[in-house]
Interface confidence: low
Amino acid sequence: LDSPDRPWSPLTFSPAQLTVQEGENATFTCSLADIPDSFVLNWYRLSPRNQTDKLAAFQEDRIEPGRDRRFRVTRLPNGRDFHMSIVAARLNDSGIYLCGAIYLPPNTQINESPRAELSVTERTLEPPTQSPSPPPRLSGQLQGLVIGVTSVLVGVLLLLLLTWVLAAVFPRATRGACVCGSEDEPLKEGPDAAPVFTLDYGELDFQWREKTPEPPAPCAPEQTEYATIVFPGRPASPGRRASASSLQGAQPPSPEDGPGLWPP
């Protein structure tokens, strides 16, 4: 530190507004105007009551992980810029963030950056023709019910559409003839006989994430003989099904990577 009366250099925190889909990484950049000899950089989130909650801290090229390992601070090569990232952002990560810097003694000074806003949006449902998700104020169970009913209705509509197309293209089908490839082939019996409509919803999130690691299946209406809705066995995305601590990418570095890494 050069002198006790050294002027403080401002901090910037960008972008001022950041929007990511849930499950994606959200990265802000905290920048120092110059590089003090010894300093601590803290990353904060503003709580609803305007309190600052510390997410992570950085000093002298070592990071002290906070309680939630999803929050990471990385110093960039230029030494002045720091990436502050949320690994696998969740809907409830939406909010106001900032960084703060502390010069160490003898001229201890504290400064905070301007605020920045993060918006984490729900992952877009597939296919794009899917009806829009219900407003956030709907409870998790109600939302699950709405999605279930919507799924059945879409299935019914598709089935009716297909029936209409078949009726138009193959008029004989309406007179009870077999619609299979060969008239000689007997009509297939069993579960595969009916057409199967695969509605790929991607990762359905029924907002029960906080209650259970794996959301229970939504209650489906009883009358579902019109279509079979197949949910493909896709692995869950880290931000949605896996706990933060199970993410390999979100693990704190091993002690060999550097000092100052503390056990939980």
Epitope: K54, R62, L104, G258
Partner: antibody
Framework: QVQLQQPGAELVRPGASVKLSCKAS?????SFWMNWVKLRPEQGLEW???????????HYNQKFKDKAILTVDKSSSTAYMQLSSLTSEDSAVYYC???????????WGQGTLVTVSA | DIVMSQSPSSLAVSVGEKVTLSCKSS????????????LAWYQQKPGQSPKLLIY???TRESGVPDRFTGSGSGTDFTLTISSVKAEDLAVYYC?????????FGGGTKLEIK
């Protein structure tokens, strides 16, 4: 001017508990970790642990995990260390010390002499 | 835990003499990412609390006389007092802040002849 005020002495019975205080002034209390260190003449200095006054996060030396509990009262800028199940081995001077960042202990209190005696 | 060893445990010197205190760690305190050694030196005078002298192994704390110099890297460190004064009578401790738990050396007691 940074100051850490600690009571001079505490006399306690074996098996009892004691809660030591450390009142901070002259700096932003919630900005820096508060550490606690034990000094016995023959054993030298031992680091007990530290607490972040900002959110009460704690890190302990495993040796003192079941002996000490570190807390803070932000409203009064005071850090506390409660020592339980005291024995003669716990007779020592206990210091609080501020830590700027994750580094050296910059400022120390005057220490509290704890004497465990029947 | 990182073990810190100091030597000698005590020594008596005359005013004006040069003194060298040694501190060794059981593992390197040098962090390759920033080439800094995570070691501090403290002075504890009789009846007083410890006082920070040196951090980052060689950075003198504000207000500390320039006769105190810290040096060394990795596992071997030295605190040198270029010309001892009577007020330097104290116990000197080294401490690593590289990893949890922070550990101190056993101390070197400096006595004045």
């Amino acid at each position: 001017q940074v100051q850490l005020q600690q009571p001079g002495a505490e006399l306690v019975r074996p098996g009892a508990s004691v809660k030591l205080s450390c009142k901070a002034s002259g700096y932003t209390f919630t900005s820096f970790w508060m550490n606690w260190v034990k000094l016995r003449p023959e054993q030298g200095l031992e680091w007990i642990g530290r607490v972040d006054p900002y959110d009460s996060e704690t890190h302990y030396n495993q040796k003192f995990k079941d002996k000490a509990i570190l807390t803070v009262d932000k409203s009064s800028s005071t850090a506390y260390m409660q020592l339980s199940s005291l024995t003669s081995e716990d007779s020592a001077v206990y210091y609080c010390a501020t830590q700027f960042g994750f580094s050296w202990l910059a400022y120390w209190g005057q220490g509290t002499l704890v004497t465990v005696s029947a | 835990d990182i073990v810190m060893s100091q030597s000698p445990s005590s020594l008596a010197v005359s005013v004006g003499e040069k003194v060298t205190l040694s501190c060794k760690s059981s593992q390197s305190l040098l962090y390759s990412s920033n080439q800094k050694n995570y070691l501090a030196w403290y002075q504890q005078k009789p009846g007083q609390s410890p006082k920070l002298l040196i951090y980052w192994a060689s950075t003198r704390e504000s207000g500390v006389p320039d006769r105190f110099t810290g040096s060394g890297s990795g596992t071997d460190f030295t605190l040198t007092i270029s010309s001892v004064k009577a007020e330097d009578l104290a116990v000197y401790y080294c401490q690593q802040y590289y990893s949890n738990p922070y550990t101190f050396g056993g101390g070197t007691k400096l006595e004045i002849k």
